[in-house]
């Protein structure tokens, strides 16, 4: 009896694991083995596929084969007993294109109201992702073990901290990787659960802000209790994106170690140009708080986020405001190559009742004004990155009178 070729060959590639699966074409024939050959692009000869010779099952692993993952290969399979079947040729494929990203490795650390998630690729030093290792982003699904209501968090890096959780509560999460450059979405990790700790008697400091005074940075924060000491630490922000880094070596700001006020002042030259993360911790001598939420601090934005300059065109029932780049000394405009959001405050000159408009655009309409009335306007710029949390000071107020009625066109 002629042996039939195996059918329906599937190639599964997850990270650096290459698995072949196929169907027996004739279940009634016993003691059949299967063998594969492969052929690289531009070659005529077929080579025996190591790891996939004389296989008795319908699955084999050819991960040990050192392939160029960007090069197309072809496979063929046959059945063998006393004689052999004809070869069944599998559609050619490029390993990289076919590969899926495996589940990442996840480590969790719990605080009372936060969880720190450390994520790394599931396959260390992967050949498949060797050129893309730095491009991985991750997304996760988190839920309270007791409720099961899921929250999704997209586009995170190898270390992520989730805040505003409840103490002594078990949270579960799963993480998957993505390579957006290659349109690849990975497989979820197993579910990891962790219980947040008992609530710390000392809350972390809040509302951290940095401003510039003379040649110094002034760091301020809020705290619930008096008679505390505080310390401030910094970290290069880019380290958060480094997938190989699992140890974050936060450094003390010398002038902000054991300070007894809710602010500290340190020279601008402590930091070279760059983006940093800052965090603050409180202590009463016996107990220590968890660290505050980390704020992003960009030395360039910090130094140069100036109030916007604007012109007003007055109509009878509205102002049209045109926002321009702020001016440096010497009247040259400052180029701010990061997205800003503008906060415009306006009020009737004879009243204290302020109204506010928040706009991304640089031309803004202030509606519903009364004719022949003097209104004053001031504006400030905010960075759109919530973690930078940086605002300019307000511009000087500009006051203008609206036109008489029926000039709104």
């Amino acid at each position: 009896k002629n042996l039939k070729s195996p059918q329906k060959v599937e190639v599964d590639i997850i990270d650096d694991n290459f698995i072949l699966r196929w169907n027996r074409s004739d279940e009634s024939v016993g003691n059949v083995t299967f063998s594969f050959d492969y052929q690289k692009t531009g070659m005529d000869n077929w080579i025996k596929l190591s790891g996939c010779q004389n296989i008795t099952s319908t699955k084999c692993n050819f991960s040990s084969l050192k392939l160029n993952v960007y090069e197309e290969i072809k496979l063929r399979i046959r059945a063998e007993k006393e004689n052999t079947s004809s070869w069944y040729e599998v559609d050619s494929f490029t390993p990289f294109r076919k590969a899926q990203i495996g589940p990442p490795e996840v480590h969790l650390e719990a605080e009372d109201k936060a969880i720190v998630i450390h994520i790394s690729p599931g396959t260390k030093d992967s050949v498949m992702w060797a050129l893309d290792g730095l491009s991985f982003t991750y997304s996760l699904v988190i839920w309270k073990n007791s409720s099961g209501v899921e929250e999704r968090i997209e586009n995170i890096y190898s270390r992520h901290k989730i805040y505003k959780l409840s103490p002594e509560t078990t949270y579960c999460l799963k993480v998957k990787a993505a390579l957006l450059t290659s349109w690849k979405i990975g497989v979820y990790s197993p579910v990891h659960c962790i219980k947040t700790t008992v609530e710390n008697e000392l809350p972390p400091p809040e509302n951290i802000e940095v401003s510039v005074q003379n040649q110094n940075y002034v760091l301020k924060w809020d705290y619930t209790y008096a008679n505390m000491t505080f310390q401030v630490q910094w970290l290069h922000a880019f380290l958060k994106r480094n997938p190989g880094n699992h140890l974050y070596k936060w450094k003390q700001i010398p002038d902000c170690e054991n300070v007894k006020t809710t602010q500290c002042v340190f020279p601008q030259n402590v930091f070279q140009k760059g983006i940093y993360l800052l965090r603050v911790q409180a202590s009463d001598g016996n107990n220590t708080s968890f660290w505050s939420e980390e704020i992003k601090f960009d030395t360039e934005i910090q130094a140069f986020l100036l109030p916007p300059v604007f012109n007003i065109r007055s109509l009878s029932d509205s102002f049209h405001i045109y926002i321009g780049a702020p001016k440096q000394s010497g009247n040259t405009p400052v180029i701010q190559d990061y997205p800003l959001i503008y906060e415009i405050i306006f009020w009737e000159n004879t009243s204290n009742a302020e109204r506010k408009i928040i706009e991304k655009k640089t031309d803004v309409t202030v509606p519903n004004l009364k004719p022949l009335t003097v209104y004053c306007v001031k504006a400030r710029a905010h960075t759109m990155d919530e973690k930078l949390n940086k605002s300019s000071v307000f511009s000087d107020a500009v006051c203008e009178k609206t036109k008489p009625g029926n000039t709104s066109k």
Epitope: H107, D112, H118, N245, H246, L247, Y248, K249, N287
Partner: antibody, heavy 119, light 107 residues
Framework: EAQLQQSGAELVKPGASVKLSCTAS????????IHWVNQRTEQGLEWIGR????????KYAPKFQGKATMTADTSSNTAYLQLSSLTSEDTAVYYC????????????WGQGTSVTVSS | DIQMTQSSSSFSVSLGDRVTITCKAS??????LAWYQQKPGNAPRLLIS???SLETGVPSRFSGSGSGKDYTLSITSLQTEDVATYYC?????????FGGGTKLEMK
Amino acid sequence: EAQLQQSGAELVKPGASVKLSCTASGFNIRDSYIHWVNQRTEQGLEWIGRIDPEDGETKYAPKFQGKATMTADTSSNTAYLQLSSLTSEDTAVYYCASWLADYSAMDNWGQGTSVTVSS
Amino acid sequence: DIQMTQSSSSFSVSLGDRVTITCKASEDIYNRLAWYQQKPGNAPRLLISGATSLETGVPSRFSGSGSGKDYTLSITSLQTEDVATYYCQQYWNTLYTFGGGTKLEMK
């Protein structure tokens, strides 16, 4: 595989100094903290301090301030512990250990260096 | 400094026993606790970090639990190779401190 190799046993006289070494393989000490721990005969473990090899920043247990000095040379992937003004109380095994991840602890240990202070 | 107390300095044990070793901190250490195993003549070996996370390669008969100031290392069914001294260590405070150790000895 991450490993730490420590220098050989030392027999030193009271009042003298000694410098112990700890060489890493399988990882870069710049990416870790290196801790030093000692253990006197039949006693428990005692933390001496830690160094960040990347910038030389150190932290010492109060008891070892002035007694121990930690340094590191990233070019040779080696950390050092210098002990000064030695007395018989300093006779112990000294271990180096690496700390490679926030979520872990002292995950790799050297085999230990025995220091005997005797006249 | 945070003091770490291991109440029993030694334990007599038999093969197959369930063993529980306790460790108490002088203040809340919020699960920043590691357990190490040390056999005579050898360097310590990390078993558990974060109070409960088992290190890769550590047998599943070992487990860690606890919170606040009180922590426990459990061995479900003691094997010959588990006879050693066990140390806890806190890392909530950067002046790291070890417990005095608990030695397991065969009856």
